[in-house]
């Protein structure tokens, strides 16, 4: 029935590899969207939430046209590594209020890891450097309260959703240019 999850088929066609990365990104976007909606239902958000440790969004309205594949893949991989760290932290330190979402957070983490492996493979196929994050990694302390962990979850899922939407846009456009 095909290769096991996380082991992409062997291909020397960068367009096919990129296509596969786009589809995984869209799949993760769907999961993130669903989980964010669940969060809003269970713990209604009072406005927008932010977290200083999250990466800043990689793009503004004007930058799509000038995107280059190496830059998009490198930035996406670095940002997703940060989101992976934040999801792991949420699962570890989120407290009892987020325990009900543990299966979904676990599945989200697995999908994130799978996408990161796919991006790493794509970058190695394209002979791109596996860049390390620019800034030093700031340790994530425990949330100040139960409400703090809920606010953090809203911020993480919201930021990941925007990052993935941006990534799908960029990757789709780049694929048409290959």
């Amino acid at each position: 029935p095909g290769p096991p999850a996380g082991s992409p088929r062997v291909s020397s066609d960068p367009r096919a590899d990129l296509d596969s990365a786009v589809l995984l990104t869209r799949s993760l976007l769907a999961d993130t969207r669903q989980l964010a909606a669940q969060m809003r239902d269970k713990f209604p958000a009072d406005g927008d939430h932010s977290l200083d440790s999250l990466p800043t969004l990689a793009m503004s309205a004007g930058t799509l046209g000038s995107l280059q594949l190496p830059g998009v893949l490198t930035r996406l991989r670095v940002d997703l590594m940060s989101y992976l760290r934040h999801v792991q932290w949420l699962r570890r330190a989120g407290g009892p209020s987020l325990k009900t979402l543990e299966p979904e957070l676990g599945a989200l983490q697995a999908r994130l890891e799978r996408l990161l492996r796919r991006l790493q493979l794509l970058m190695s196929r394209l002979a791109l450097p596996q860049a390390a994050p620019d800034q030093p990694v700031i340790p994530l302390g425990p949330p100040a309260s139960a409400w703090g962990s809920i606010r953090a979850a809203h911020a993480i899922l919201g930021g990941l959703h925007l990052t993935l939407d941006w990534a799908v846009r960029g990757l789709l456009l780049l694929k048409t240019r290959l």
């Epitope: 869209r26 976007l29 969004l57 503004s60 309205a61 939407d165 846009r169 694929k175």
Partner: antibody, heavy 119, light 111 residues
Framework: EVQLVQSGAEVKKPGASVKISCKAS????????MDWVKQAPGQRLEWIGD????????IYNQKFTGRATLTVDKSASTAYMELSSLRSEDTAVYYC????????????WGQGTTVTVSS | DIVLTQSPASLALSPGERATLSCRAS??????????IHWYQQKPGQAPRLLIY???NLESGVPARFSGSGSGTDFTLTISSLEEEDFATYYC?????????FGQGTKLEIK
């Protein structure tokens, strides 16, 4: 009730531009992207482009790149599509539709705006 | 671009009959666990209305007599027992890739 309400019909001369608005209500505007679709008489529906209300960053059907411009006004929960250098083939009904890039189907549609290009 | 071909172009049936509409894609639109095909209904002077998403999921508020099936390149919309209000034009749409495209439509008419 989730609704998309579009601006009224337009008649334009060849070479002119038209800007159509689409006002969203009944849902959180930033939670969905806005897509635009063209339906010319006797032709199949044609996707024009998609915009994310939070980050902007529209993507376009290559056929419309350079002539279509998608924008949003977040504070007014309104999306806009401007089409420039109009020609007779642009005579059509234009729809805004609520979408998202994960699965990319359109679950809520505006009522449509008829644009007629005629000299 | 992926081309979607719908058949038949028109179909004349009576209320109570079963309708089977076909949509064929020029390349596979199924991958990563999803079939990226969606079905819409459009009546004259109205906007399209989503019926089925991701090949087989019934949109909220759509009657259960509508169903979708298929994978890869061949998809089907079935209306199990036609009602008067079902006579309209039906479009399939893919979202596998950029740009999403639509089929040319199947017009369902009363016999």
């Amino acid at each position: 009730e989730v609704q998309l309400v579009q601006s009224g019909a337009e008649v334009k001369k060849p070479g002119a531009s038209v800007k159509i608005s689409c006002k969203a209500s009944g849902y959180t505007f930033r939670d969905y992207n806005m897509d635009w679709v063209k339906q010319a008489p006797g032709q199949r529906l044609e996707w024009i482009g998609d915009i994310n209300p939070t980050i902007g960053a529209p993507i376009y059907n290559q056929k419309f790149t350079g002539r279509a411009t998608l924008t949003v006004d977040k504070s007014a929960s309104t999306a806009y599509m401007e089409l420039s250098s109009l020609r007779s083939e642009d005579t059509a009904v234009y729809y805004c539709a609520r979408g998202e890039l994960a699965h990319w189907y359109f679950d809520v549609w505006g009522q449509g705006t008829t644009v007629t290009v005629s000299s | 671009d992926i081309v979607l071909t719908q058949s038949p172009a028109s179909l004349a049936l009576s209320p109570g009959e079963r309708a089977t509409l076909s949509c064929r894609a020029s390349k596979s639109v199924s991958t990563e666990g999803y079939s990226y095909i969606h079905w819409y209904q459009q009546k004259p002077g109205q906007a399209p209305r989503l019926l089925i998403y991701l090949a087989s999921n019934l949109e909220s508020g759509v009657p259960a007599r509508f169903s979708g099936s298929g994978s890869g390149t061949d998809f089907t919309l079935t209306i199990s027992s036609l009602e008067e209000e079902d006579f309209a034009t039906y479009y399939c749409q893919h979202s596998r890739d950029l740009p999403p495209t639509f089929g040319q439509g199947t017009k369902l008419e009363i016999k």
